[in-house]
Amino acid sequence: APVPPGEDSKDVAAPHRQPLTSSERIDKQIRYILDGISALRKETCNKSNMCESSKEALAENNLNLPKMAEKDGCFQSGFNEETCLVKIITGLLEFEVYLEYLQNRFESSEEQARAVQMSTKVLIQFLQKKAKNLDAITTPDPTTNASLLTKLQAQNQWLQDMTTHLILRSFKEFLQSSLRALRQM
């Protein structure tokens, strides 16, 4: 499911519950995705010892995964709500191609991988409603994404395992950073 239980507007199981605010819905959606990533990481970590490797050992890769930096305005120091929101949405849009790559990379967690992908699409929609400056958000080029996907899928098994691990870890860190920032807004 792309939305956490109880989030769907058609959910009538708890009629007396206060409807969630936009911020609460975004917060809950991120936590839901993080739970999904955690489940996927369990499968990848059981299959290889990459999760034990230090970040330095895995730093040498040519993946251009989105990462928060001071200039993005999402840290406590130099916090800027609008700049940060643009970075979060742009970063999530950039992660979409990597989430597409994760599909078919899992045996026992195939549905979970799909749920993470679909939930991220929903999260992007939630955030776009919150953003005032949508013009500043750059959407990745579909042709570039298609060739990147082909390139990633053509890697040998070891590199595909490594890529899967790095995507999950980077996406987790990006979402955690986003959540910390959104909770300051």
Epitope: S54, A69, Q76, L175, Q176, S177, R180
Partner: antibody
């Protein structure tokens, strides 16, 4: 395990750097926080370092305390120290697997005394 | 800014007693609350996280409950080893706060 070092007797105004060193694991995979405890008082959170460059500090610590990180150590730089900063300083590890901060491994603490 | 208020600040109890400590957050923190035990001269030890999940190796006589703003730590049957100071800590947001920890509750022998 975690071990703090660098605590000593200093005079007011002296800068001081405390170091938290990990044994048996790489700190690069974890968040690290600093907490202090004045004699006979409660725990007081100072700040946390997430990745290599994202930090957060208690309101009273901003500008006077700085946390930085390598793969094996995390430093706490303190400036403009006063007698009120006299405390045992602890570093603690957050396994960073979830979104909420919780500190599941602690060092034994290092004592900082500020006195003229 | 989120503030954590713990009560009582101290209590006296006997071995075998049921002990309850409460912690209140100034705004909703979901279930993102941890409890720690500290003995004199020692580092704090994580007891409970996510309001009710027991940390590894913690005896089952410890339990936690609550969500939103009100939380409780319960020791079902106090043991000699449990006389210590207990702290709650919010893990919801560590930005723009004075302290992540509550003031502490000292559990003493009656």
């Amino acid at each position: 395990s975690l071990e703090e070092s660098g605590g000593r007797l200093v005079t007011p105004g002296t800068p001081l750097t405390l170091t938290c060193t990990a044994s048996g694991f790489s700190l690069s995979n974890y968040y690290v926080t600093w907490v202090r405890q004045a004699p006979g008082k409660g725990l007081e959170w100072i700040g946390i370092i997430y990745g290599s460059d994202e930090t957060a500090y208690a309101t009273w610590a901003i500008g006077r305390f700085t946390i930085s990180k390598t793969s094996t150590t995390v430093d706490l730089k303190m400036t403009s120290l006063t007698a009120a900063d006299t405390a045992t300083y602890f570093c603690a590890r957050d396994d960073s697997s979830d979104w909420d901060a919780k500190f599941n491994l602690w060092g034994q603490g290092t004592l900082v005394t500020v006195s003229s | 800014a989120i503030q954590m208020t713990q009560s009582p600040s101290s209590l006296s109890a006997s071995v075998g007693d049921r002990v309850t400590i409460t912690c209140q957050a100034s705004q909703s923190i979901n279930n993102e609350l941890s409890w720690y035990q500290q003995k004199p001269g020692k580092a704090p030890k994580l007891l409970i996280y996510r309001a009710s999940t027991l940390a590894s190796g913690v005896p089952s006589r410890f339990s936690g409950s609550g969500s939103g703003t009100d939380f409780t730590l319960t020791i079902s049957s106090l043991q000699p080893d449990d006389f210590a100071t207990y702290y709650c800590q919010q893990g919801y947001s560590l930005r723009n706060i004075d302290n992540a920890f509550g003031g502490g509750t000292k559990v003493e022998i009656k």
